[in-house]
Every structure is written in C-alpha cells, then in structure tokens.
Interface confidence: medium
C-alpha cells in the first residue's frame, strides 16, 4: 500500500473494475474531498513535552537503555468490508462479528516514509477497495483479520524525537472515477470502521510482558515503562459534513435519515419519497391555478410525504457541531401541500434531553415557506430532527431542502480529535496515565512509581528525599521562620518517617507569613485533563490560614489565582490526599504555598508527594473543558 | 450591552400601539429578540419572537393577531404592534435577546414598557 | 404548554440565611431550565441557566440543581441587595413558559 504527501497516493484500485459509471457531480471539489477525509493532528506542543519528559538527549544514556517509539492507524475491518459486500476468498462474512479470539488478528501495511513526511509536512494514506481487501482479507484461504493497520513506527519515532511542527496525518477514500457516491460510501465506511492513531513509548530494560492489543508490540521482556496513546475522533459517530454544515437538496442522497424509512421499489406504499420536479408536475400535485403549476415546484428533486391521519413524520440529520452563534436550520417546505399539519424541530444534543427549535416561517416564492431556526452553539454534538404532524385526514407535504448553515467560525472546528493515553503494567494491567507517577502504587510491582517518574523534570514529581527539588523561598533573615525539608520524627507520624516539607508556626507576638515557590511548569496543553496532586497535613493548632497559589505568566505579567485555602485548623493531625484540578491554565506557572498565622499559633504545616500529572502535558481531552461561569 | 424599551403609554380600548426595543452594544442581527408580557394574574407570557436577520416571526398561539412584530436592522430596533387593545393589554411588556445554547435563555432584558388601555 | 410551578410564592428571610426555592415542571424539561430575579424597579436579570450554570456577573452565592421535573434554586448568604422576585423558565418545549414567580423579602 502506498502513501504519499499532499498528493497523496493511491491504496490501490482493482485492476478491471466494473464499467465506468457517472462520477460524483462533478466529482468532489477539493473542500469536498477534504470533507470525506478523517485528519489527525498531533500538536507540535505534544512532541516538545513527549520529548522533554521522556526522552532524554540521546548522549545521557547508552543506546542500549533508550526509550523507543512506535506508532501504526488502525481500522476496524467489519465496516469495510460490508462496503465491498461479499467476496471471495472471505472466510467469515462481512456481516458478521470477527472471529473471536483473544487478540484480535490484524495485518499490518506499509505506512509513510520519513523523507516524504519530511518534504510535504503531511502524510496522506488514501484507501481504496484493493487497501481493504489486501489489509482485511489477504490472499485466499487465510482467515480474515478483525483490524486494518498502516505502520507509522518510522514515521513516529522520527517525528518525536527530531520532527519540528505538528504530525498531521489524513486519511482518505482513494479518488477514481466510479459511480455517484462511491467516495461519499468509502469515506463513511472508513468513519465506521473507527479509524485511530495508535502510539507508544517505552523505556528499554528488563520486564516481562505481552503487547496491548493492537498495538506494534516492543519484544515482551525488554521495557520498564510503556506509554501508550490512542488518538481518536471523541464522537466517532460525526459525519465529515459536521464540518461545514449540512445542505441537501434532494438532488443527490442525502445523509438524512426518515422515518418511516424513504420509499425504494421494493415498498410501495410510501411516506417520504424523493420524486423530481417534472414526475409532481405530471402526477398534478399541486392545486395551484394551472398557469402557476410549472412554477410552483423547484428544479431537481424534492421529498413529498405522504400521511395518513394523526401520523408524525421525520427527517433526522446526521450528528453535527456547531462552533458559531448563527447556526441555523433552514427547510423550505410547501404551504398549499399541508394545510392541516405543522412541522416541529428538535435539537437532540449528544447526552442532553431533546428540546423544541423555534421554527420562523419566511413565504417564499410560488407557494413555498422556508422556514428557520437557530440552533445557536450547543456545548455538544447534536443531530435535528424535523418532525410533520399531521392532523385529520390524509395529507400530502413537500420539502425542497434541508439545510444547517452557518455551523461554523472563521477555520471549521471539525471534529474534536482525543488523545487518550495509558501506562501498561508489567503484567497488562492498563492504567490512565493520570495514574502514573502519583505517589500511588497502581501496579502490581509499583512500576508506575519507578524510572520514568524519578526522571522527570525537577519538580514534577517531588517526595523531598533529595531536598526541595525546586521549592525556594526568598532570602531570609535568621530570625524569620521558614520552611525546611525534614522528616516528621513523631510517634504519631510512624506511618510517615520519610522527608516532608514542613512550617513549624510556633507562637509569635506579631502576625507572621512564610511564602515557598515551585519551581517553574511549562503551560499544560488545552484541554487536557491537568490536575495537581498532593498530601498536606497540620498537627496542632493553627491560627491563621495556608493558601496553595497558582500563578500564571501571562505575557510578561504575573497572575495569581488560590486554587486551595485551609484555615484556623485544629484538626485531626493526618495525612490528607488531594487533587486539584488545574483548569483554563494557559500559561506557565509556578505554585505558592503561602502561610499566615498570629498569636496562640502552635502548628506544623507539612506537604509531600506533589505531583504534575503528566496528563497535563501528554493528554488531549476531545471536548475543551467549561467552565461554569461562562455565559 | 443595552435594549432601551419606549416610555410609558396610555391608550384608548379598541385602538392600537406600537412598543419599540432599541439594542446597543451588540450586533442586532446576531440574535433574536422576543417580547414577554407581565401581568399580576397571568405572570409572564411569552409573545413571540423575531429573527432581525430575515423577518422571520413566531408568535405563542395565544397572541397570534394581538401582536404583530417587526425590526429595523438600520436602526438596531424592534418593534411589536398590539391591536384591538382591551384592559386585560395593560401590563408591563419586556423585550429580551435570547441566547441560542444551553437551554435558550434570555440573557438581557429591556427596563419594561407599561402600557395603560383607558378610557 | 408546558406548566412551571413554582413554590413558595413569597418568603421572608434574614440576611446571611440560605434560602431555597423550587420549581416543577409538568413533564421533563430535560435540565433546560433557567432562573431570573426581577428587581422591585422591574430590572429582569438573567441568574442561571441550564439548570446550574452561572451567568457571567451573578454572584457565586447562587446556584441551581436539578433534573427531570424537578429544580431549585438556592440564595447561600443572603444579602440584602437580594431583595426582588424570583421566576424559573422552561426552553425545552415551545412556547417558553415561567413560573408564577418568589417574591423573596427581607425579615
């Protein structure tokens, strides 16, 4: 299977096809072709964080201890193969499940090449029927594969350790000259067939292991740490049109689906049916003065419904987004058709209750009403369904168009690409990566606690055992109190005889204030899943308060922000675990641990085990985060 | 951002009157903009609404011929037209812009026209 | 139409309290559900919108919860610029209705 950049090369087409048919109209324009693709975009800020936080300069280690990447896109193979239908040599039909087996089987393809990627600064892989059959089914008389893979390790390992800029990938149907809809069929099948981006990194050393499934597999008995990611679309269900909105004419088929389903030859007895203008011109439709009957209907095709009494109709639209405030839905309809029903939209957000769009009728020309709704900017994918309510005896109703405009602003969102990531266990146990590194044993031997973290830049990941790592204060007079780093040498702490970094508020006539600072974290990426972790603990009575500070640099000027406050304690003397959540941080930062206490103070404050989730820098969630006080 | 409501009116039964809305600080073509009444027995009612950019209206079933609504995109405008004016038309009548997502909310709201039919 | 009750239809509190007003739909209103305070001059103002989310500029001292049929709305520290009248309104379901309304009242 080839590949290519911008171009993009073919993945095959069977040598003698069936005839030529018709092509698209026009066959797809470059927007439209670009519609029918999926693309990956793997930031550029990813790389530099991938690249910071786990792979060191290659001369720090021996090649023989260097971590290694792999990467390889994956489909699944089902969904293609019931675009081809049945054929031969296929030892399990396309209709049904994959064999079950433990693994899923799947047949690898060659992907792109370093010097390609290098030149055009995009790998296009286009799939075509003989891609599939070549990845799905291979020669005859072996089994079929579950799972369609191009191999990306090259590619990746290059990327991720001397690439510059992000790593797009674009994924598309081959383009040929074949019948109406081909490409519009391939490129909903490859949407199907759930197509991810699969990568890994794993530090080299001794362990014992079996490969995730689906994934290029490091030799079982030579890592200590394995990342994993899987970039996927976080609403796989989207159609490439959620891009640029929605218009169907009727001219062409649509995504839109109807119920009761749309009339074919094989159900005579009909409720929606596309018909072209001439056949209602001869089938006398309309009750329009003769003259005016030409007139009345459009050009093309248009959808006619026809109901029987107390019937409810609708025409549903595939999921879509919307990035603008102007999202509208447009549908022209005939008024003289359906004197006795209404219509009513609804918006069906992904994971909300449905709610009622307000409908504005706008006469139209000859009879016809386009009426309109806004749909606005819902936080999530939606679908709108038109119903007709028909009321009394049989009635007949046309619609000219449907259309959802104005869906996007300025460059189109597309379709919000996760980047979801894991920490494999040595014994296959998969943990989020938000788990790794936490100061909490999640594997069975504690390895998401070992190498990888202790090598992490200083501050990220800090218990104290060797110093500050990073925490400073300011110059201090002997006589100001200050924060040190020692171990809490109290029979009631045996369960914490390790190093902390402690406050000791003893007594004082004045006021005091003791501030410590991090060292400096680089911005998390948008939208990721960024947290803060950390064990805090005040023994003895505290009259005043500590407050945990995050500032920003924002564009040279520094901004602060509590993210935690305790005050005038007098508590239990334990050990507390919390998470903060670190949302809208866009900058980089740096946090304060800040203290305030007066008289009759007599308390130690301690911190220990703070961590950075590598989430932070190495997780992409699909839906930006929202926070609740935007309006 | 802005909707200034027209003062006060006092009118004759049976005769009609024309409320205006003026929006600032906004695009007016970006949002729709509704008419509530407010009455001490019925509450708040909602009247209908106009989309600026296309004359587009839609009206609660309850006011269609009572009201007839309109804008004026060259002078950032709305307007609704009460007819056939009764005692029961006189309450307070609001303007309001409503905000598409979430759950279509009216997030600004004029100060309030009171409208008084006597004769 | 869609009927929103709301209950109480007045309520006398001190400053500082909290304080809770319901709203019941006649049929699942699907979290589409906002909260409005009109002040003793008719300013109508916008509070919370989907159930609990907070319009930009309301004082985080209000909330919202909820789900179904049933919603509240909840004052935490009452101050007495909270003085005004309370409606809930429904979106899910044309026309869009309110509740009759809560006047609250300072003790």
């Known amino acids: 299977v080839g590949s290519g950049m911008g171009t993009g090369q073919r993945a095959g087409s069977p040598a003698a096809g069936p005839p030529l048919q018709p092509r698209e109209p026009l066959s797809y324009s470059r927007l439209q072709r670009k519609s029918l693709a999926v693309d990956f975009v793997v930031p550029s800020l990813f790389r530099v964080y991938a690249r910071d936080l786990l792979l060191p300069p290659s001369s720090s280690e021996l090649k023989a201890g260097r971590p290694e990447a792999r990467g390889s896109l994956a489909l699944d193979c089902a969904p293609l193969l019931r675009l081809l239908g049945p054929a031969p040599g296929v030892s399990w039909t396309a209709g049904s499940p994959a064999p079950a087996e433990a693994r899923t089987l799947s047949r690898v393809l060659k992907g792109g090449s370093v010097r390609k990627l290098r030149r055009a600064k995009q790998l296009v892989l286009e799939l075509g029927e003989e891609a599939i059959l070549e990845g799905c089914v291979g020669p005859p008389g072996e089994a079929a594969v579950g799972l369609l893979q191009f191999n990306l390790s090259e590619l990746f390992s290059w990327w991720i350790r001397q690439g510059e800029g992000r790593l797009r990938i674009r994924l598309m149907p081959e383009k040929k000259a074949s019948e109406v809809g081909r490409e519009g069929r391939l490129s909903a099948a490859i949407r199907a067939s759930q197509p991810r981006l699969l990568f890994q990194i794993f530090g080299t050393g001794h362990s014992s292991l079996e490969s995730p499934t689906n994934m290029p597999s490091p030799s079982p008995d030579y890592f200590t740490w394995n990342l994993t990611w899987i970039m996927k679309d976080s609403f796989p269900f989207l159609s490439h049109r959620s891009r640029y909105g929605l218009e169907c004419s009727f001219d062409f088929p649509c995504e839109l689906e109807y119920s009761p389903p749309l009339h074919d030859l094989r159900n005579q007895s009909w409720s929606w049916r596309r018909i072209p203008s001439e056949e209602a011109s001869q089938m006398d439709l309309l009750d329009g003065p003769g003259a005016e009957r030409s007139k009345e209907m459009p050009r093309g095709s248009f959808l006619l419904l026809n109901t029987s009494a107390d019937s409810k109709h609708t025409i549903l639209s595939p999921w879509m987004r919307s990035s603008s405030e102007h999202c509208t839905l447009a549908v022209s309809v005939h008024r003289h058709l359906q004197p006795s029903g209404r219509y009513i939209a609804q918006l069906l957000p992904h994971n909300e209750a449905a709610r009622e769009i307000l409908l504005m009728p706008t006469p139209g020309k000859h009879g016809w009403t386009v009426l309109q709704g806004r749909i606005g900017r819902p936080d999530n994918p939606f679908r709108v369904a038109l119903e007709y309510i028909s009321s009394g005896n049989r009635s007949l109703s046309a619609v000219d168009f449907f259309a959802l405009k104005n869906c996007s602003e300025g460059t189109s969102p597309g379709s919000k690409m996760a980047l979801q990531s894991s920490f494999t266990c040595w014994n296959g146990t998969v943990l989020q990566l938000g788990q790794a590194c936490d100061f909490h044993q999640d594997c069975a031997q504690g390895e998401d606690e070992s190498q990888m973290c202790r090598k992490l830049p200083v501050g990220f990941y800090c218990n104290f055992e060797d110093g500050f790592c990073g925490w400073t204060q300011g110059t201090l007079s002997p006589h100001t109190p200050q924060w040190q780093v020692r171990t809490l040498k109290d029979a009631r702490f045996q369960d914490h005889q390790d190093h902390a970094l402690l406050l000791s508020t003893t007594d004082v006539p004045a006021s005091e204030s003791a501030t410590v600072t991090s060292a400096t974290f680089p911005a998390p990426i948008k939208s990721s899943p960024c947290e803060l972790r950390m064990s805090w603990l005040i023994r003895g009575v505290l009259r005043g308060n500590v407050s945990l500070v995050l500032v920003e640099n924002k564009t040279g000027k520094e901004q602060g922000r509590m993210v935690w406050h305790v005050a005038a304690y007098e508590g239990l003397s334990l050990w507390q675990w919390m998470v903060l959540p670190l949302l809208d941080v866009s900058d980089r930062f740096w946090l304060q641990m800040v203290a305030w206490w007066g008289q009759g103070s007599r308390a130690i404050v301690a911190f220990d085990n703070i961590s950075i989730s590598l989430d932070c820098y190495l997780t992409i969630s699909g839906e930006d985060k929202i926070l609740q006080n935007t309006a | 951002l802005q909707l200034q409501q027209s003062g006060a009116e006092l009118v004759r039964p049976g005769a009609s009157v024309t409320l205006s809305c003026k929006a600032s600080g906004y695009t007016f073509t970006d949002y729709e903009m509704h008419w509530v009444k407010q009455t001490p027995v019925h509450g708040l009612e909602w009247i209908g609404a106009i989309d600026p950019e296309t004359g587009g209206t839609a009206y609660n079933q309850k006011f269609e011929g009572k009201a007839i609504l309109t804008a004026d995109k060259s002078s950032s405008t709305a307007y609704m037209e009460l007819r056939s004016l009764t005692s029961e038309d006189s309450p307070v009548y609001y303007c309001?812009?409503?905000?598409?997502?979430?759950?279509?909310?009216?997030?600004?709201w004029g100060q309030g026209t009171t409208l008084t039919v006597s004769s | 139409d869609v009927q929103m009750i709301q209950t109480p239809s007045s309520l006398s509190a001190s400053l500082g309290d909290r304080v809770t007003i319901s709203c019941r739909a006649s049929?699942?209103?699907?979290?589409?559900l906002n909260w409005y305070q009109q002040k003793p001059d008719g300013t109508v103002k916008l509070l919370i919108y989907?159930?609990?989310r907070l319009h930009s500029g309301v004082p985080s001292r209000f909330s919202g919860s909820g789900s179904g049929t049933e919603y509240s709305l909840t004052i935490s520290n009452l101050e007495q610029e909270d003085i005004a009248t309370y409606f809930c309104q429904q979106g899910s379901a044309l026309p869009p209705t309110f509740g009759g309304g809560t006047k609250l009242e300072i003790n």
């Open positions: 989907y159930t609990s």
């Open positions: 309001a812009r409503r905000r598409y997502y979430g759950s279509s909310s009216f997030d600004y």
């Open positions: 049929q699942d209103i699907g979290n589409y």
